[in-house]
Structures are given as structure tokens and as C-alpha cells.
């Protein structure tokens, strides 16, 4: 069956060193446990996180995301997932693409992460 992939309405903001959550879901909602779900970074399609055959596929991750990501699947039965990225870096800023693949049918949604420096301040005078 066909579906759309829905990402966040607006850019997501995070501070360097914090963790951030990138939500993604299918519409209409349905069980996505058996689907392939993933995030990659355009334009070079570097894999941020991949979930396939009911498991996280750590081996496919780009090195800069290894050990820093977690797919929250509490609501995957309704087609809703969240990617948690820990220890956010400046290099994480920019575009991410989330996709759901059901057999040969795939849809995706773009989202943007803005990363800010928690120690940034303007020097007086």
C-alpha cells in the first residue's frame, strides 16, 4: 500500500554536545515493524542510521555516526519512529532525509538540523 513520509514541520535546533531527536512517520499510519527505515545525509547519501529486518544495521553506518545514534521504536507499530543523535557536533548541521521502504515502495522526507554553540556570547563593548 502507498503512504507518505512526514518529517518535522520546522527545522530542529540542538546545542553542541547535547542529544537531539529527529521524528519521522508514515501517513496514513500503519505498522512499520517489517519495513526498512533509515536516515541518510544528502547529497552523498551517507547512512546515519538504518533499520532492516527488525534490527538496527550498525555496519552500514557512516563512521561519524557510529555509536551516536539510536532508533526509538516505541510507536513503530503505528508507523512512527524517532532518530536520537547523541553528542551533537557542528558537522551534524544541515539536511537529513528519512525514508520508509515497504518491499519495492519507498517514500522519504527531508528535514533540517540547526546546531548552535552553547558557549557563544557577544563580548561587551
Amino acid at each position: 500500500g502507498q503512504f507518505r513520509v512526514i518529517g518535522p514541520r520546522h527545522p530542529i535546533r540542538a546545542l553542541v554536545g547535547d542529544e537531539v531527536e529527529l521524528p519521522c512517520r508514515i501517513s496514513p499510519g500503519k505498522n512499520a515493524t517489517g519495513m526498512e527505515v533509515g536516515w541518510y545525509r544528502p547529497p552523498f547519501s551517507r547512512v546515519v542510521h538504518l533499520y532492516r529486518n527488525g534490527k538496527d544495521q550498525d555496519g552500514d553506518q557512516a563512521p561519524e555516526y557510529r555509536g551516536r545514534t539510536e532508533l526509538l521504536k516505541d510507536a513503530i507499530g503505528e508507523g512512527k519512529v524517532t532518530l536520537r543523535i547523541r553528542n551533537v557536533r557542528f558537522s551534524d548541521e544541515g539536511g537529513f532525509t528519512c525514508f520508509f521502504r515497504d518491499h519495492s515502495y519507498q517514500e522519504e522526507a527531508a528535514m533540517e538540523l540547526k546546531v548552535e554553540d552553547p558557549f557563544y556570547w557577544v563580548s561587551p563593548g
Epitope: 507518505r4 512526514i6 518535522p8 514541520r9 521524528p23 512517520r25 501517513s27 516505541d74 510507536a75 512512527k80
Partner: antibody, heavy 120, light 106 residues
Framework: EVQLLESGGGLVQPGGSLRLSCAAS????????MSWVRQAPGKGLEWVSA????????YYADSVKGRFTISRDNSKNTLYLQMNSLRAEDTAVYYC?????????????WGQGTLVTVSS | DIQMTQSPSTLSASVGDRVTITCRAS??????LAWYQQKPGKAPKLLIY???SLESGVPSRFSGSGSGTEFTLTISSLQPDDFATYYC????????FGQGTKVEIK
Amino acid sequence: EVQLLESGGGLVQPGGSLRLSCAASGFTFSSYAMSWVRQAPGKGLEWVSAISGSGGSTYYADSVKGRFTISRDNSKNTLYLQMNSLRAEDTAVYYCARDYWLDSDYFDYWGQGTLVTVSS
Amino acid sequence: DIQMTQSPSTLSASVGDRVTITCRASQSISSWLAWYQQKPGKAPKLLIYDASSLESGVPSRFSGSGSGTEFTLTISSLQPDDFATYYCQQVYIYSTFGQGTKVEIK
């Protein structure tokens, strides 16, 4: 089965306070944002407040900002609305609703509502 | 704030009629729109979300369409159980509801 059960409504004088509670069951409470929506007698629906699944982010309608406080206790699967400095125009049925997923989202499950009457 | 305007406010129809309710947003909300049905003394019930996705368990005679600022809810063949008040809701920036459309028996 998802269930939401509000309590705490009643009659209160203008300027008074009230705390509403919403007991949730049938889903992973901490994974969902939650909201309060109200409906004045014979009127339409008005979104009041929302809170993220972790409780770390809260949102308010301008009409209640500074007077109402939304909170949640994920260990008790319970949502709260503390209402202070109540006014006659706050009289309404207050519904607790599960956000479809994220903060300020669609509402896929609703409680039965609890009536708050502000009158002297 | 984003304002939502529904039309008509009241609609008189008969069983079997095709019914259309319109909702206009004061600015573009993409497809971040839902439709609810409410009966007297009851909580609202989600019918449509993301402008056109049918909520699980909702009869297929209900459908939604539109994007940007103009949206419609259509009931293809009105049933006795469908006489109620219908609300649209935007969730693009916080959440606001339309004023409601009451569908009554002609």
C-alpha cells in the same frame, strides 16, 4: 485500549485555583506529547496547552499564558493542568487529549471531559 | 496566530446526500490539517489527518483534500450517524480550530 480519564473539575470563584488530572492507560505514555483542549458551553474547541513526551517542552495558548501550568508524571502515567487566577471566561469542559505523536499535533484520543465552572 | 475559517456554519442535508465542508487557513499550513466529528455531550473524534489520511476505523465515505490554505471534508453519502458538528484544526504553528460546521437533518 487507549483510555484517558480526567478529574478535578468543579465550581470555583473568580481568582481561584483548580488542578485537573488526566490518568492515561493503554499506551506508552512517555512516548507521546499530551494536550488540554477546552470547550465553553455551546461554543467551539480551543487548544489550551501541550507538553512533550519527556515533559521538557511546554506550550500555551495566549489566553492562558502565565496563569495555567501543564505538567506530567510519566511514572504515574498522569497529565496535569494547574489553573490559577481563574476567570469567568475559563468556564468550559476541559478535555485531555493524546497528541498524535509530537507537540501541538493532531489529537487521536480524547478523554470524556471535566467541567470547570468559574462563578461567584 | 493562524486563523481557521469554516464554511458553511450550518448545513442542512438528507441521508444519502454528498456533503462538502470547506476550511480556509489565514496562511499556508501545507498539509498540517485535521478534521474532527463531535456529537452533543461527547468528545471530538479524529476523522482525517495530514489533510487526506483517513484515521483507522473511520468509514471510507469520509475523505479530505487540499493543501496550502484551502481544504475540504467530503462525506460521499450522508448516513444517519453523520449528523454532528465538524471541526477543522491546523497544527502547523501550535494548534487552532475552525469555528465548526453543524450538519443537521433537512
